[in-house]
């Protein structure tokens, strides 16, 4: 009996109620492998989802997110609202990154600026809401007598603009 079912190709299911004949998948369903005992439900891409690939008798539909949203989870199971760079999505919507944090993408959370001093370096370029700080040479490298091809930029604290 097992062998009869294994003969059923993708796009069909093995119908135990009908002496294990291979029946075509009903509308809005598919089977991507042979020998199936039932067909799987075609995914619907609606609302914030849009269809990237239609369902066929042998493969599921594939969804993307509409403009202004991005995919999350396995097989784009959820769509999350985009924010601007320099923002993060909270329960109350998109909010600007707090001072000392940044987000350079339309998704994800604001992350703290790199602490240059932990690596013994100084801040070369200030951080913003959209960009991390850029760390430069260590303060020791900037001391008089240290060899440097170009004069070093003045060290600044993160977030403080040059006067």
């Amino acid at each position: 009996l097992q062998d009869l079912c294994s003969n059923c190709p993708a796009g069909t299911f093995c119908d135990n109620n009908r002496s294990q004949i291979c029946s075509p998948c009903p509308p809005n369903s598919f089977s991507s492998a042979g020998g199936q005992r039932t067909c799987d439900i075609c995914r619907q891409c609606k609302g914030v989802f849009k269809t990237r690939k239609e369902c066929s008798s042998t493969s599921n539909a594939e969804c993307d997110c509409i403009s202004g949203y991005h995919c999350l989870g396995a097989e784009c199971s959820m769509c999350e609202q985009d924010c601007k760079q320099g923002q993060e999505l909270t329960k109350k919507g998109c909010k600007d990154c707090c001072f000392g944090t940044f987000n350079d993408q339309k998704r994800g959370i604001c992350r703290p600026w790199t602490n240059c001093s932990l690596d013994g370096k100084s801040v070369l370029v200030n951080g913003t809401k959209e960009r991390d700080v850029v760390c430069g040479p260590s303060p020791a490298d900037l001391s008089p007598g240290a060899s440097s091809a170009t004069p070093p930029a003045p060290a600044r604290e993160p977030g403080h603009s040059p006067q």
Epitope: F13, C25, P26, P27, N28, S29, S31, S32, A33, G35, Q36, R37, T38, C39, D40, I41, Q44, K46, G47, A74, E75, S77, M78
Partner: antibody
């Protein structure tokens, strides 16, 4: 005939992890979508999530921080883990394969969360 | 999430009577709806898929209808073995959601 059988502890203490196994016969979990659902006292059902033929998982957002569904294709089994359980997680847990035209259910296993 | 409102929550009916149970979705679900029957101590059994298609082996006295947001399950002539709890389930959108159930008992 496709059969699904749930197994695991019937009593779990609050704050601990609930772990259940679904053993599948008559079908291969390398095809299709394999789900967990639960039915609370009072007959309310909740869909918990799935693991797919490709090993990708979907979780109900209401459980997302606590749930994990995994599988072992060599044993043709898939698993539910629910962390930090409370008495509200007391329910009969069912593994299922939703399908068209047939949907297959396990017989269900009652899990009580109690100190 | 799509909310499925099922009614009535319980009912008594006589043998031979026509019985109708309804499910209303909070949005259009494109007929992506199952009806299940659950008897005491048993796991649910599928009666109807895609709102109106009878599963092979299910008695023809069961039928499903509806579209958009409104769906119903009808038993044309109630038999004793039909008592149990009936549930609708939408599979149009994740997470799938169930109706609250209708407990059907014999008068």
């Amino acid at each position: 005939e496709v059969q699904l059988q749930e197994s695991g502890p019937s009593l779990v203490k609050p704050s601990q992890t609930l772990s259940l196994t679904c053993s599948v016969t008559g079908d291969s979990i390398t095809s299709g979508y394999w789900n967990w659902n639960r039915k609370f006292p009072g007959n309310k059902f909740e869909y918990m999530g799935y693991i797919s033929y490709s090993d990708s998982a979907y979780y109900n957002p209401s459980l997302k921080s606590r749930i994990s569904i995994t599988r072992d294709t060599s044993k043709n089994q898939y698993y539910l883990q629910l962390n930090s359980v409370t008495t509200e997680d007391t329910a009969t847990y069912y593994c299922t394969r939703w399908g068209i035209p047939f949907a297959f259910w396990g017989q269900g296993t009652l899990v009580t969360v109690s100190a | 999430d799509i909310k499925m409102t099922q009614s009535p929550s319980s009912m008594y009916a006589s043998l031979g009577e026509r019985v109708t149970i309804t499910c209303k979705a909070s949005q259009d679900i494109d007929s992506y709806l199952y009806w299940f029957q659950q008897k005491p101590g048993k796991s649910p059994e599928t009666l109807i898929y895609h709102a109106n298609r009878l599963v092979d082996g299910v008695p023809s006295r069961f039928s499903g209808s509806g579209s958009g947001q409104d769906y119903s399950l009808t038993i044309s002539s109630l038999e004793y073995e039909d008592m149990g709890i009936y549930y609708c389930l939408q599979y149009d959108e994740f997470p799938y959601t169930f109706g609250g159930g209708t407990k059907l008992e014999i008068k």
